[in-house]
């Protein structure tokens, strides 16, 4: 004979447990039904009557099967430095995460309680450790032979370009400037010839041509955005 299916509420076998989506009610001393996500207990079970559930009210939720008398309140609206990545529904809490360029300075169980802006490394300093969702950028001084000329939360120190002839030596905040040894074409006054330097940058950056000038013209230093370092958070 097949085992009889027990309908809630029922007394569990001695030493036994209740089934999935049921709980043992200590007062009724019975296995009783839990309420599904999005609902809560409105009337607890008795010895002969099962749990009665009701929907969560607006701005409240339950995420799990439960027998709580009240749904949980959804968190407050996301602040201006946050993005709502999960809306408040009857089955889930609102989740706020930090928007790009920010990191979570004070986290909570899900999402972030307090966001802070990622640190920007000033010229002469590069990103040693990129910012993550939960940690700030760490800056370090550019080592000899490298530079950073930007104020950025993503740019690393890049190697100076190697010149056949150095016009201006590089420092921590400026690239080296090369003097061209190849003959220059006739150009309009003030025009700049940009030959390819001997070596390219590290793999983190795209090659940037060095300026070359005709005698008597002023130097033009290239300033442009460099791509974000791997794993960092862009603006």
């Amino acid at each position: 004979l097949p085992a009889q299916v027990a309908f809630t509420p029922y007394a569990p076998e001695p030493g036994g447990t209740c089934r999935l989506r049921e709980y043992y009610d200590q007062t009724a001393q019975m296995c009783c039904s839990k309420c599904p996500p999005g609902q809560h207990a409105k009337v607890f079970c008795t010895k002969t009557s099962d749990t009665v559930c009701d929907s969560c009210e607006d701005s409240t939720y339950t995420q799990l099967w439960n027998w709580v008398p009240e749904c949980l309140s959804c968190g407050s609206r996301c602040s201006s430095d946050q993005v709502e990545t999960q809306a408040c529904t009857r089955e889930q809490n609102r989740i706020c995460t930090c928007r790009p360029g920010w990191y979570c300075a004070l986290s909570k169980q899900e999402g972030c309680r307090l966001c802070a802006q990622l640190r920007k490394c000033r010229p002469g300093f590069g990103v040693a450790r990129p910012g993550t969702e939960t940690s700030d950028v760490v800056c370090k001084p550019c080592a000899p032979g490298t530079f950073s000329n930007t104020t950025s939360s993503t740019d690393i120190c890049r190697p100076h370009q190697i010149c056949h002839v150095v016009a201006i030596p590089g420092n921590a905040s400026m690239d080296a400037v090369c003097t061209s040894t190849s003959p220059t074409r006739s150009m309009a006054p003030g025009a700049v010839h940009l030959p390819q330097p001997v070596s390219t940058r590290s793999q983190h950056t795209q090659p940037t041509p060095a300026p070359s000038t005709a005698p008597g013209t002023s130097f033009l230093l290239p300033v442009g955005p460099s791509p974000p370092a791997e794993g960092s958070t862009g603006d």
Epitope: Q26, T27, K42, V43, F44, T46, S49, V52, P69, E70
Partner: antibody, heavy 119, light 106 residues
Framework: QVTLKESGPGILQPSQTLSLTCSFS??????????VGWIRQPSGKGLEWLTH???????YYNPALKSRLTISRDTSENLVFLKIANVDTADTATYYC???????????WGQGTTLTVSS | DIQMTQSPSSLSASLGGKVTITCKTS??????IAWYQHKPGKGPRLLIH???TLQPGIPSRFSGSGSGRDYSFSISDLEPEDIATYYC????????FGGGTKLEIK
């Protein structure tokens, strides 16, 4: 408006049976999820839950007193009854009836009736 | 059976002040605790249920908190009508009251 009112003999002798009545209005014991219970307070002491009865006639008793207690009801007359057998001086107390709602909280109470057990 | 230990048994406080009462239970009661105010000649009045939820019409001067086996109840901005005895009630496993706390005003 929910109201409850207890009534009883006032004085009993040891070994007698106490009969108490709770008369209530503003709700019905035919209403799903409602019940009526009894709580007492010996003079100068704290509250003690005794028993209660649900809309579906399920009954619960304080394990320490279960053998002496009987709760019953008359839903048509909005009455709940409590009997305590073999009373003793330790049963001298104020007896309250209270409504209990589906989440098991006593939310409305009567003013109480006093019982003195004395020989 | 669950045992309820309520403390203090009595306390005295000044008008406008704040008092806190605690209830410790012999086992985890999953926040199923209520707090009552009881005045002589009347039935107890439900103030708070499920640890911290105020009953309708109860002023926000009354508050409750706790979890597991430790629970507390506070009254701030004490008023003369707060003079009463206060009880905790667990309703996780049958029903059991704490011993009560008699509040007096200095």
């Amino acid at each position: 408006q929910v109201t409850l009112k207890e009534s009883g003999p006032g004085i009993l002798q040891p070994s007698q049976t106490l009969s108490l009545t709770c008369s209530f209005s503003g709700f019905s014991l035919n209403t799903f999820g409602l019940g009526v219970g009894w709580i007492r307070q010996p003079s100068g002491k704290g509250l003690e839950w005794l028993t209660h009865i649900w809309w579906n006639d399920d009954k619960y008793y304080n394990p320490a007193l279960k053998s002496r207690l009987t709760i019953s009801r008359d839903t048509s007359e909005n009455l709940v009854f409590l009997k305590i057998a073999n009373v003793d001086t330790a049963d001298t107390a104020t007896y309250y009836c209270a409504r209990i709602e589906g989440l098991r909280r006593f939310d409305y109470w009567g003013q109480g009736t006093t019982l003195t057990v004395s020989s | 059976d669950i045992q309820m230990t309520q403390s203090p048994s009595s306390l005295s406080a000044s008008l406008g002040g704040k008092v806190t009462i605690t209830c410790k239970t012999s086992q985890d009661i999953n926040k199923f605790i209520a707090w009552y105010q009881h005045k002589p000649g009347k039935g107890p009045r439900l103030l708070i249920h499920y640890t911290s939820t105020l009953q309708p019409g109860i002023p926000s001067r009354f508050s409750g908190s706790g979890s597991g086996r430790d629970y507390s109840f506070s009254i701030s901005d004490l008023e003369p009508e707060d003079i009463a005895t206060y009880y905790c009630l667990q309703y996780a496993n049958l029903w059991a009251f704490g011993g009560g706390t008699k509040l007096e005003i200095k």
